[in-house]
Interface confidence: medium
């Protein structure tokens, strides 16, 4: 079951996803989309970076930490209900089979009316970057090249959910999707 | 070296059946997944489906559901294309292909002719 | 499901530079790749994710995604990179191709 992380409505969100660099600067592509991890790549992509910078990002979403450092942790700004649900981070980290996903969902509660003004708490101050759940520590890498970023692992599970929710759905963007790198 | 050999053109009468067998080797077979693609003449490429040579799994894309279906022989690293009920319209070069970054790997294409 | 468009032909002078374009909404979300096939044989992926070469593929093709438009980029055009080009991404677990566009080297 996914991982859960709360935030208010008008706060921002921190959904975390680490990474080790096999060495300073060998960055490895990542991905973060709204919904399941799918078997490749993400689906709804809402920014990704590749071996270099963040090369396509929507407003609001954001790193907030150093990811040349492997934090690629998401901050969703000022949310509103509509932004909860499921986030995929996928961390394509070549080699056969060896992307690392992550699901982590977010709720969005109401936000509190409060008699006086206090310090806004978000995400960070809940969910202390230290204090990440299993699965969602480094990940080791070891080389980089032009290799598959293919995970078959997940391909029987979701393929039972795609007949659940009828495959014949045009396969959309949704959180039970396959897709491929 | 890594490569997909296909099996050889097949002509077809319409309703008839058709398996194209696709071997793979140089690298672990059951450590990517296989895809099918369609070429009609003339045409561009067209995706067909997907198979884990794990599980056996099967992703088909829209319009190659139910005539068409993906198998394997795990013991020689062998992925198969079934084609049943053949239509004119099947006629096409068929091509099985490693999904990577992007599809890396072809095989040399099986032409399939239906025609009466 | 995405929907891939590409022009279906494209001339360039020997020599020259050969820009093949792939249209598709928020393309620049998406990891492109890029195909080349000749006459009579199997394609062959000559970009992958956007701009990466695969090895043998000449550094003369170069590939970039942005906004709504990938590009493929052909400098010093040769009389061998006279082929089709097909554009794909991934969507929802099914491939999905562009219409294929016919590089004339004149």
């Known amino acids: 079951s996914e991982v859960e992380y709360r935030a208010e409505v008008g706060q921002n969100a921190y959904l975390p996803c680490f990474y080790t660099p096999a060495a300073p600067g060998n960055l490895v592509p990542v991905c973060w989309g709204k919904g399941a991890c799918p078997v490749f790549e993400c689906g709804n992509v809402v920014l990704r970076t590749d071996e270099r910078d963040v090369n396509y990002w929507t407003s609001r979403y954001w790193l907030n930490g150093d990811f040349r450092k492997g934090d690629v942790s998401l901050t969703i700004e000022n949310v509103t209900l509509a932004d909860s649900g499921i986030y995929c981070c996928r961390i394509q980290i070549p080699g056969i089979m060896n992307d690392e996903k992550f699901n982590l969902k977010l709720v969005i509660k109401p936000a509190k009316v409060t008699p006086a003004p206090t310090r806004q708490r978000d995400f960070t101050a809940a969910f202390p970057r230290m204090l990440t759940t299993r699965g969602h520590g480094p990940a080791e890498t070891q080389t980089l090249g032009s290799l598959p970023d293919i995970n078959l692992t997940q391909i029987s599970t979701l393929a039972n959910e795609l007949r659940d929710s009828r495959l014949a759905n045009d396969l959309r963007d949704s959180g039970a999707t396959i897709r491929i790198g | 070296q890594v490569q997909l050999v296909q099996s050889g053109s097949e002509l077809k009468k319409p309703g008839a059946s058709v398996k194209v067998s696709c071997k793979a080797s140089g690298y672990t077979f059951n450590n990517y997944a296989m895809t099918w693609v369609r070429q009609a003449p003339g045409q561009g490429l067209e995706w067909m489906g997907l198979i884990n040579t794990k599980t056996g799994d099967t992703i088909y894309a829209q319009g190659f559901t139910g005539r068409f279906v993906l198998s394997l022989d795990t013991s020689v690293s062998t992925a198969y294309l079934q084609i049943s009920s053949l239509k004119a319209e099947d006629t096409a070069i068929y091509y099985c292909?490693?999904?990577?970054?992007?599809?890396?790997?072809w095989g040399q294409g099986t032409t399939v002719t239906v025609s009466s | 499901q995405s929907v891939l468009t590409q022009p279906p032909s494209v001339s360039v002078a020997l020599g020259q530079t050969a820009r093949i374009t792939c249209g598709g909404n928020n393309i620049g979300s998406k990891n492109v790749h890029w195909y080349q096939q000749k006459p009579g044989q199997a394609p062959v992926l000559v970009i992958y994710r956007d701009s990466n070469r695969p090895s043998g593929i000449p550094e003369r093709f170069s590939g970039s995604n942005s906004g709504n438009t990938a590009t493929l980029t052909i400098s010093r055009a040769q009389a061998g990179d006279e082929a089709d080009y097909y554009c794909?991404?991934?969507?929802?677990?099914?491939?999905?191709f562009g219409g294929g566009t016919k590089l004339t080297v004149l």
């Open positions: 292909a490693r999904p990577t970054y992007g599809m890396d790997v």
């Open positions: 794909q991404v991934w969507d929802s677990s099914t491939g999905v």
